[in-house]
Interface confidence: medium
């Protein structure tokens, strides 16, 4: 074991020698060429700035990306949708929109009058939410409740009309008891031509310039588009 | 990146009508509503349409309808301005801008450089 | 139409001050508000949204407060860069309207 040992510190000797005669060499040539060195550590700061600079203009590329990068999944996760059912599955709906029942619905989270919620719907390519059903009834107020809300009814032209041409007389009707009134009681000016649902899910005719809150909806279709 | 490039600006007299365009790259183009502004010096940024993503719907400044048409072709990723009986009140730096994803707004949130139009005689 | 009224049309800074400019709209506009940045020859750059939300990218010395009819633009300490002309923008309701734009200078 001693002769062991003395091998082990034969050879730690050894390898402190050489450490300390090829430090030596480092030192002096570090003294020979001290300015060179001062130069390459500003290089490698500058080039260290640039790579930090670098590093930030990706990290800001990429959350800009991060940001859009629903949008633009919109589309593709609609075609694997088809493409998975054979072209016999109805396409999903888009980024913010719900999808119930064969239709999408988006949900505003503020107010406009009657016809600037409209006008938005359309340049979604949708139009304020017709209600045809019960069942579809009871989806809306889930998701609006407790707001006033601004659905596609308007009687603006002396009958009452849904925006999609959908028949009224025969359709479905939720009116709340005494409604429609065309109350001209509010001293707002004008008749009440525009139908809103209440928090408790009946319809009122109400002043078309009231700001309410809205809801859109567009029909889907099996073409890997929304209508 | 996203990115928006006007042309087709240029002079023209009075009455005459001019067309531009729009390119538009590192998006999904069809999925946007896009938006056309104009810039002059004496009246500042003033909008002029806004078309939807599909390009069905479109609404226009009471300045310029009847005159002007938004219309925009996805499958080439173009927004087009068509400009009728130009007036010299038209002379502006034409933008269009992108209609950004504001929940229930019309804001824009991307705008090209602009192209110079001119009406004189 | 919705009127917008900004204010002041120009200022003069140090670099390190704080800058602050109003927005009025004549009627409510909720939040529905933009504060754009525009360069000499460059394109408008995007920089507040839904009134107080910073964009993607854009320095942390940039905010935005307000709602209803009453907005505020800060810029909490302007460097060299953020010599430009900001405007304000409504987007509750087409004809989308904006500002007639601050010029800022450093002094």
């Known amino acids: 074991q001693s002769a062991q040992l003395q091998a082990e510190l034969r050879s730690l000797k050894e390898a402190f020698s050489n450490f300390s005669s090829s430090t030596l060499t480092e030192v002096q040539a570090i003294s020979t060429h001290g300015g060179s060195v001062g130069d390459k550590i500003t290089s490698l700061g500058a080039k260290l700035e640039k790579q930090q600079q670098d590093l930030k203009a990706d990290h800001d590329a990429l959350l800009f990306h991060l940001k859009h990068f629903p949008v633009d999944l919109r589309f593709v996760a609609c075609q694997m949708e088809l493409l998975h059912s054979n072209g016999s599955q109805r396409t999903c709906c888009p980024v913010n929109w719900v999808e119930h029942q064969g239709s999408c619905y988006w949900f505003s989270h503020s107010g406009k009058a009657w016809a600037e919620a409209e006008k938005y719907c359309q340049l979604e390519n949708a139009h304020l939410v017709v209600i045809n059903s019960w069942e579809e009834q009871k989806f809306i107020v889930q998701h609006t409740n407790p707001f006033n809300t601004w659905i596609g009814l308007t009687d603006s032209d002396g009958s009452w009309k849904w925006v999609d041409g959908t028949d009224y007389r025969h359709n479905y009707k939720n009116w709340a008891v005494t409604q429609p009134d065309n109350w001209h009681g509010h001293e707002l000016g004008g008749s009440e031509d525009c139908v809103e649902v209440q928090p408790d899910g009946r319809w009122n005719d109400d002043f078309c310039l009231q700001v309410y809150r809205w809801v859109c909806e567009k029909r889907r279709n099996a073409t890997g588009e929304v209508a | 990146q996203v990115q928006l490039v006007e042309s087709g600006g240029g002079v023209v007299q009075p009455g005459r009508s001019l067309r531009l365009s729009c390119a538009a790259s590192?998006?999904?183009?069809?999925?946007?509503?896009m938006h056309w502004v104009r810039q002059t010096p004496g009246k500042g940024l003033e909008w002029v349409a806004i078309?939807?993503?599909?390009?069905?719907?479109?609404y226009y400044a009471d300045s310029v309808k009847g005159r002007f048409t938004i219309s925009r072709d996805n499958s080439k990723n173009t927004l087009y301005l068509q400009m009728n009986s130009l007036r010299a009140e038209d002379t502006a730096v034409y933008y269009c801008?992108?209609?950004?994803?504001?929940?229930?707004?019309?804001?824009?949130?991307?705008w090209g450089q602009g192209t110079t139009v001119t009406v004189s005689s | 139409d919705i009127q917008m009224t900004q204010s002041p049309s120009s200022r003069s800074a140090s670099v390190g001050d704080r800058v602050t400019i109003t927005c009025q709209a004549s009627?409510?506009?909720?939040?529905?508000l933009n504060w754009c940045q525009q360069k000499p020859g460059k394109a408008l750059k995007l920089l507040i949204y839904?009134?107080?939300t910073l964009e993607t990218g854009v320095p942390s010395r940039f905010s935005g407060s307000g709602s209803g009819t009453d907005f505020t633009f800060t810029i909490s300490s302007v460097q060299p860069e953020d010599i430009a002309t900001y405007y304000c923008?409504?987007?509750?309701?087409?004809?989308?309207?904006f500002g007639q734009g601050t010029r800022l200078e450093i002094k």
């Open positions: 801008a992108r209609r950004g994803n504001s929940y229930g707004g019309y804001g824009m949130d991307v």
């Open positions: 590192g998006f999904t183009f069809s999925s946007y509503g």
């Open positions: 078309i939807s993503y599909v390009g069905k719907n479109k």
């Open positions: 009627q409510d506009i909720s939040n529905y």
């Open positions: 839904d009134a107080s």
């Open positions: 923008q409504q987007y509750d309701n087409v004809p989308i309207t």
